[in-house]
Amino acid sequence: MRTEAQVPALQPPEPGLEGAMGHRTLVLPWVLLTLCVTAGTPEVWVQVRMEATELSSFTIRCGFLGSGSISLVTVSWGGPNGAGGTTLAVLHPERGIRQWAPARQARWETQSSISLILEGSGASSPCANTTFCCKFASFPEGSWEACGSLPPSSDPGLSAPPTPAPILRADLAGILGVSGVLLFGCVYLLHLLRRHKHRPAPRLQPSRTSPQAPRARAWAPSQASQAALHVPYATINTSCRPATLDTAHPHGGPSWWASLPTHAAHRPQGPAAWASTPIPARGSFVSVENGLYAQAGERPPHTGPGLTLFPDPRGPRAMEGPLGVR
């Protein structure tokens, strides 16, 4: 198990390893310090859900797990294997919302999450463009992107659309779990550093009386729980049966599973590459496996922006400027 890999370095030394003791004692503080520094990294989750009422439309939901306020959200989609993409919607908390076909309704759900309903009929079918990306900007901290993939499947599948409730529970569990582990880790780190400062070089002790061994084992489950709790995940139930999709990959079974670490989802790969990706110990991931019966046409051309601006419930109506390069 992963957590056990760290434990041996914290166990008492064997005879003749006196010089290494100081180094070994410092392993845990460094690991905890790294945990304290990295656990605050913002992340993005993505959920794609087929609408039960209309098989040809579905909803994309994206959320930001971070402390900063959102300055802009961009939702885009594109074809598989690195094909070019297009912007579906841009949501600005003050200037409003812009969206482009086949996006039907983009809106803020909370201050840190958005939803986008897509129309999927004919050439505009979502199946024709298999990857969705959400990018959250938090000025001046930075921006983060996560992508969810809609792989073509040989069988539509029978799975039901997921409910958003588990995602919210997972978010809460992630926040509470990491906070707890962080608090414990940082306090413990301070305790260790203080002890290290006020103690002479440690002497060799037999394994039964060593204070380090129990401490290492007590910490290992904490690391495991941190890894387990910090997984705000989203289920994407999707399998498309594209009519004309050049890069369709044949799949042997009714369902296609992949795990996608959203904090590292920079450039989408093909389904085959994702299938072997291990579930990350830390970070959001998107598991894919859905029943979507929409017929996919060709990838639509990049349509121009709609002339109507959709007001943001949290800000004034957007200004309508000159059209850009869409």
Epitope: S71, L72, V73, T74, S76, W77, G78, G82, A83, G84, G85, T86, T87, V90, H92, R95, G96, R98, T131, C133, K135, A137, F139, P140, G142, S143, W144, E145, C147, H266, R267, P268, H302, P305, A318, M319, E320, G321, P322, L323, G324, V325, R326
Partner: nanobody, 127 residues
Framework: EVQLVESGGGLVQPGGSLRLSCAAS????????MSWVRQAPGKGLEWVST????????SYVDSVKGRFTISRDNSKNTLYLQMNSLRAEDTAVYYC????????????????????WGQGTMVTVSS
Amino acid sequence: EVQLVESGGGLVQPGGSLRLSCAASGFTFSYYDMSWVRQAPGKGLEWVSTINSNGGRTSYVDSVKGRFTISRDNSKNTLYLQMNSLRAEDTAVYYCVEGDPHNFGLENLSLRDFGSWGQGTMVTVSS
């Protein structure tokens, strides 16, 4: 985390040329429109040029048309701005940003109106 890193700025004489580059990482570069904006000393942010996701469409502010050329290489995740016939009024910090400022209008532009932004590169045109 998304990163945009500009390079290629410097001191150049009027009439000279510079090529700015912007290396992108941490996001699906080929899915997004990209722009260059600039901020002259003591002035507000000004839009310079935008290119769409596949490089097929470009647009420029009137003052740089015919002199500046925006381009991108999606295979290298890089955005470029070729600046020719430079003038003193082109002196500014040039920022590489993700997004098209036309979405919400060009008035009172701020870096917070974009999906991603770089740290900027200084271009000084002086004899």
